[in-house]
């Protein structure tokens, strides 16, 4: 004879656990049904009646099978420096990510609490390490023989053009000016920008994932743009 299928609520056999999508109710001492994602427990089970589930209200959600008395509140609306990459539904929380040109400055758990604008390296400085979703740009002074004449979060220091006859020598923030009509470059003309964002292990406060990096989402608004730092500008 096939084993009899127990319907919830039921008392589990000693030493056994409840089945998938069931939980053990300590008060009733019975295995009872969990509520599906998008629902919550309106009435807990008893020895004679199963869990009564109800749909989550607007702006609340449950993502997992559960027996919580109330659904979780969705995060606040995405702020002006964020993009909503996942809407708040009955089954999932809103996800906000920092918009292009910004990075997540505070992420202690899954999600992001604070977006901040990527640092821009001022003339005379180039990008040493590019920004990522979770880390700022690092600027460095242009070494002798190289320059950057832009205020940018992506431009690196470029080599001065090599002149047959130099009219004006280059410096850290200005290219050399040649008198001859055919200067030569020591670098391919396309190699000016670093792709952004780029993930790099040595990036400033670049997180080391284990085993996987959580998505960057945002819930709070920063107070304003960054003021200038050494070799950088908040503009």
């Amino acid at each position: 004879l096939p084993a009899q299928v127990a319907f919830t609520p039921y008392a589990p056999e000693p030493g056994s656990t409840c089945r998938l999508r069931e939980y053990y109710d300590q008060t009733a001492q019975m295995c009872c049904s969990k509520c599906s994602p998008g629902q919550h427990a309106k009435v807990f089970c008893t020895k004679t009646s199963d869990t009564v589930c109800d749909s989550c209200e607007d702006s609340t959600y449950t993502q997992l099978w559960n027996w919580v008395p109330e659904c979780l509140s969705c995060g606040s609306r995405c702020s002006s420096d964020q993009v909503e990459t996942q809407a708040c539904t009955r089954e999932q929380n809103r996800i906000c990510t920092c918009r292009p040109g910004w990075y997540c400055a505070l992420s202690k758990q899954e999600g992001c609490r604070l977006c901040a604008p990527l640092r821009k390296c001022r003339p005379g400085f180039g990008v040493a390490r590019p920004g990522t979703e979770t880390s700022d740009v690092v600027c460095k002074p242009c070494a002798p023989g190289t320059f950057s004449n832009t205020t940018s979060s992506t431009d690196i220091c470029r080599p001065h053009q090599i002149c047959n006859v130099v009219a004006i020598p280059g410096n850290a923030s200005m290219d050399a000016v040649c008198t001859s009509t055919s200067p030569t470059r020591s670098m391919a003309p396309g190699a000016v920008h670093l792709p952004q964002p780029v993930s790099t292990r040595s990036q400033h406060t670049q997180p080391t994932p284990e085993p996987s990096t959580a998505p960057s989402t945002s819930f709070l608004l920063p107070m304003g743009p960054s003021p200038p730092a050494e070799g950088s500008t908040g503009d």
Epitope: C104, A105, L106, S107, K108, Q109, E110, G111, R113, L114, A116, T134, S135, D136, H204, T205, P207, P209, E210, P211, A214, L220, L221, P222, M223, G224, P225, S226, P227, A229, G234
Partner: antibody
Framework: QSVEESGGRLVTPGTPLILTCTVS????????MGWFRQAPGEGLEWIGS?????ITYYANWAEGRFTISRTSTTVDLEITSPTTEDTATYFC??????????????WGPGTLVTVSS | AGDMTQTPASVEVAVGGTVTIKCQAS??????LAWYQQKPGQPPKLLIY???KLASGVPSRFSGSGSGTEFTLTISDLECADAATYYC????????FGGGTEVVVK
Amino acid sequence: QSVEESGGRLVTPGTPLILTCTVSGIDLSNYAMGWFRQAPGEGLEWIGSRRTDGITYYANWAEGRFTISRTSTTVDLEITSPTTEDTATYFCGRDVGGDGGWYFNLWGPGTLVTVSS
Amino acid sequence: AGDMTQTPASVEVAVGGTVTIKCQASQSINIYLAWYQQKPGQPPKLLIYDASKLASGVPSRFSGSGSGTEFTLTISDLECADAATYYCQQGINNIGFGGGTEVVVK
């Protein structure tokens, strides 16, 4: 609940050293942890922080020089190739919890590392 | 990011007086700032978090304010036990401390 660092000692430059932060009464799956140091007579310096999901943030200067790892009851800090500038008291701190700012409300007494040839 | 400028480096105040310590962040950190007290031979003690919230067990003589890049710690009705070094700390991923302020109580 308590936090205690151990493993600090006199080492020669270049000799790897592992410091251990042992917690008691704390579920490390619920709390982020941080490592800090303080050179004699100097201010506090952050080395790195480890989230509950294993993601680790390092200070720019500490990247590649230090590695933070975790077991169920310890958080280790490896100084991969110590220099004399790494001489300091090293502190382990437990974060307040939650998903807000990084703040540390439970600290160990510190362990002294001296790097000298 | 990560630079915190703390002033003054040292201050001497009489018992019962008030001391104000300022901290400036190099980028906007919203309210994510903490203040710590440290005495010689001891680890830091959290006093204030989220710029103005008092940590558990900390007397109300300690108060914090500010947001964005400018923050202040105020200690009123100063006691001899308040003699210590005080640090601000930005609570973002790139944690950074101020240089510290030594408070001498006379």
